[in-house]
Interface confidence: low
């Protein structure tokens, strides 16, 4: 599923991601844009054989498991393919463990260079939330 | 249960390209991956690639580049792989299977015979 | 490439012989190190997952064993059934990689 940006705040605020560990909604969207472009089935391979799945591109190393991932450590304690739902439970329940991981959204390399220090309240801008 | 279900035989003439079926039923088709294995006589089972049908992704092993291209169609639960430039190294039994790491699901096979 | 080296090429035995089946891999490959059946004119058939996990459905006599560089596949006690071809796999990396195979076949 592509989500469109007004759609995707409001999913994302419905499973209580707003203001989570003090990161605003805008924050989470501008993630989700260019992590995946809003694609729930976005995946990408990594250098070190690992992939990224979702809306927010969880990495296989550490936190779900595809069965593909050696020395996988699985903290979100899911199959990686739960994470190409439609329905993003499963992604905001695992981004929900990472960001309080102690690196906050710094875990997520996109957010960290497209989206940290910008006006990312324009994400959620016009939308009935 | 989970089943792969491939094309069947083909006899082809080189120079010619063939595309090659593996319908899948009995699991949630978007979200593993299908591997695709190339098996000749004396030469064991080589990987061909990978395609994720949920989202088009696909990995080639660097051998089959612009010999092999996957696709899949999610409204029949159908991968594809075509096979271009046919010549008679291309002869053999072509497999998909389930991707989980191991391949604990394959289909039965597909026979290409390429011959003037 | 990873590459993995069966050995031997070709075992026979006595049904009722125990055997070993041996893979070698070209670099350390943690336990990512999958056993196959394969009969003639049939798909291959998952034995062991992860170098010591049986796959659902096989025989107890089916066991493996090994962690890096070297594996082995055991049957205990060999029946007429399993005759045939035994090839491995590698999940480490990519390209997936596939041994040789060892023929097992009836003295």
């Known amino acids: 599923k592509v989500f469109g940006r007004c759609e995707l705040a409001a999913a994302m605020k419905r499973h209580g991601l707003d203001n989570y560990r003090g990161y605003s909604l805008g924050n989470w969207v501008c993630a989700a844009k260019f992590e995946s472009n809003f694609n729930t089935q976005a995946t990408n391979r990594n250098t070190d054989g690992s992939t990224d799945y979702g809306i927010l591109q969880i990495n296989s190393r550490w936190w779900c498991n595809d069965g593909r991932t050696p020395g996988s450590r699985n903290l979100c304690n899911i199959p990686c393919s739960a994470l190409l739902s439609s329905d993003i439970t499963a992604s905001v329940n695992c981004a929900k463990k990472i960001v309080s991981d102690g690196n906050g959204m710094n875990a997520w390399v996109a957010w960290r260079n497209r989206c940290k220090g910008t006006d990312v309240q324009a994400w959620i801008r016009g939308c009935r939330l | 249960q989970v089943q792969l279900q491939e094309s069947g035989a083909e006899v082809m003439k080189p120079g010619a390209s063939v595309k090659i079926s593996c319908k899948a039923t009995g699991y949630t088709f978007t979200t593993y991956w299908i591997e695709w294995v190339k098996q000749r006589p004396g030469h064991g089972l080589e990987w061909i690639g990978e395609i994720l049908p949920g989202s088009g992704s696909t990995y080639y092993n660097e051998k089959f580049k612009g010999k092999a291209t996957f696709t899949a169609d999610t409204s029949s639960n159908t991968a594809y792989m075509q096979l271009s430039s046919l010549t008679s190294e291309d002869s053999a039994v072509y497999y998909c299977a389930r991707g989980d790491g191991f391949y604990c699901y394959w289909g039965q096979g597909t026979t290409l015979t390429v011959s003037s | 490439d990873i590459e993995l080296t069966q050995s031997p090429a070709t075992l026979s035995v006595t049904p009722g012989d125990s055997v070993s089946l041996s893979c070698r891999a070209s670099?350390?490959?943690?336990?990512?190190l999958h056993w196959y059946q394969q009969k003639p004119h049939e798909s291959p058939r998952l034995l062991i997952k992860y170098a010591s996990q049986s796959a659902s459905g096989i025989p107890s006599r089916f066991s493996g064993s090994g962690s890096g560089t070297d594996f082995t596949l055991s049957i205990n006690s060999v029946e007429t059934e399993d005759f045939g071809m035994y090839f491995c796999?590698?999940?480490?990396?990519?390209?997936?990689?596939f041994g040789g195979g060892t023929k097992l076949e009836i003295k």
């Open positions: 796999q590698q999940s480490n990396s990519w390209p997936r990689t």
């Open positions: 670099q350390s490959i943690s336990n990512n």
